[in-house]
């Protein structure tokens, strides 16, 4: 039985040209995290963090994605096209797969508010 829950940064907004941290946290389970996948709204993989192999950033995102902090991901040089859903997928033993969702809105405004509150989707 899967007892854990994924907490995410929820709905966040950030300024065009700026950067943002995408963060998920798995709690309420003793399952061991073996891999975390980060996916974009169109299901393209941004990055994978494997317990043994470490981080792999996919070539299309190499220049704009930085691993961390922790199991999170930092998106840099944001464009309007980055607006949309992002998913973290936690592969765990023996629970299986947990999935969290974050919605990022990239704003033209120079005074874009960067809100990052933890919430359970």
């Amino acid at each position: 039985m899967m007892t854990g829950t994924i907490e995410t940064t929820g709905n966040i907004s950030a300024k065009k040209g700026g950067s943002v941290i995408l963060q998920c946290h798995l709690s309420s389970t003793m399952a061991q995290v073996t891999q975390v996948n980060w996916e974009q709204h169109d299901h393209s993989l941004l990055a994978i963090r494997n317990a043994e192999l470490g981080w792999h950033i996919y070539p299309a995102f190499k220049d704009r994605v930085a691993p961390g902090p922790g199991l999170g991901l930092t998106l840099q040089s944001l464009t309007m096209n980055d607006t949309g859903e992002y998913f973290c997928t936690y592969h765990t033993y023996p629970d299986g797969t947990y999935r969290g969702r974050i919605f990022l809105e990239v704003l033209e405004s120079s005074v874009a508010e960067h809100s990052a509150r933890f919430q359970i989707p």
């Epitope: 061991q32 317990a51 043994e52 023996p94 299986g96």
Partner: antibody, heavy 120, light 107 residues
Framework: EVQLVQSGSELKKPGASVKVSCKAS????????MNWVRQAPGRGLEWMGW????????AYAQDFTERFVFSLDTSVTTAYLQISSLKAEDTAVYYC?????????????WGQGTLVTVSS | DIQLTQSPSFLSASVGDRVTITCRAS??????LAWYQQKPGKAPRVLIY???TLQSGVPSRFSGSESGTEFTLTISSLQPEDLATYYC?????????FGQGTKVEIK
């Protein structure tokens, strides 16, 4: 080369305790969950449970909650199985087995097994 | 808990025969199933994981398939060294239990 090397056979009296060791080499112990499996003479494989090698937290299968303890010493890359208040029915080969960290999991490396015999 | 029922418990076949062993799960387990071979006096070794993926170094005469909650291990052409007991195991959730085992004898 990944290896799991277990301690040697043990002959114990009923009521005694035993501690079986499983020395991991060729990989980072804390990245892979470790399992314990029992096989009584002439019987099948029984999954006893596992230990989260990242946090040290153990989880036990239903029949192994009472007298069985899984532990780790990461400084010597070794997992342990301790059984207390031994009974004749604990006579078995005990295996440690590493969980592969593919997305579907399986036990990709096994120790050679440790025979524990409980007899008066 | 999800139960695994493995059959047959024993089979005897000739060298070159095609052999199939079945493992049925009481509920859906997706592809979280592995097959192991245990030769007498030895530790088990994984043959198939993810229901259908052949472990590196395992001969190609071994294959796995799935259909709903039924999983099959096939040995396309039995060899003398295949004398062993074969176990299925579910890995989708605690407990990661094994099937009862199938002992394969060479006629």
């Amino acid at each position: 080369e990944v290896q799991l090397v277990q301690s040697g056979s043990e002959l114990k009296k009923p009521g005694a305790s035993v501690k079986v060791s499983c020395k991991a080499s060729g990989y980072t112990l804390t990245n892979y969950p470790m399992n314990w499996v029992r096989q009584a003479p002439g019987r099948g494989l029984e999954w006893m449970g596992w230990i989260n090698t990242n946090t040290g937290s153990p989880a036990y299968a239903q029949d192994f909650t009472e007298r069985f303890v899984f532990s780790l010493d990461t400084s010597v890359t070794t997992a342990y199985l301790q059984i207390s208040s031994l009974k004749a029915e604990d006579t078995a080969v005990y295996y440690c087995a590493r969980t592969a960290i593919t997305s579907v999991y399986h036990f990709d490396y096994w120790g050679q097994g440790t025979l524990v015999t409980v007899s008066s | 808990d999800i139960q695994l029922t493995q059959s047959p418990s024993f089979l005897s076949a000739s060298v070159g025969d095609r052999v199939t062993i079945t493992c049925r799960a009481s509920q859906g387990i997706s592809s979280y199933l592995a097959w192991y071979q245990q030769k007498p006096g030895k530790a088990p070794r994984v043959l198939i994981y993810g229901a259908t993926t052949l472990q590196s170094g395992v001969p190609s005469r071994f294959s796995g398939s799935e259909s709903g909650t039924e999983f099959t291990l096939t040995i396309s052409s039995l060899q003398p060294e295949d004398l062993a007991t074969y176990y299925c195991q579910k890995l989708n959730s605690h407990p990661c239990s094994f099937g009862q085992g199938t002992k394969v004898e060479i006629k």
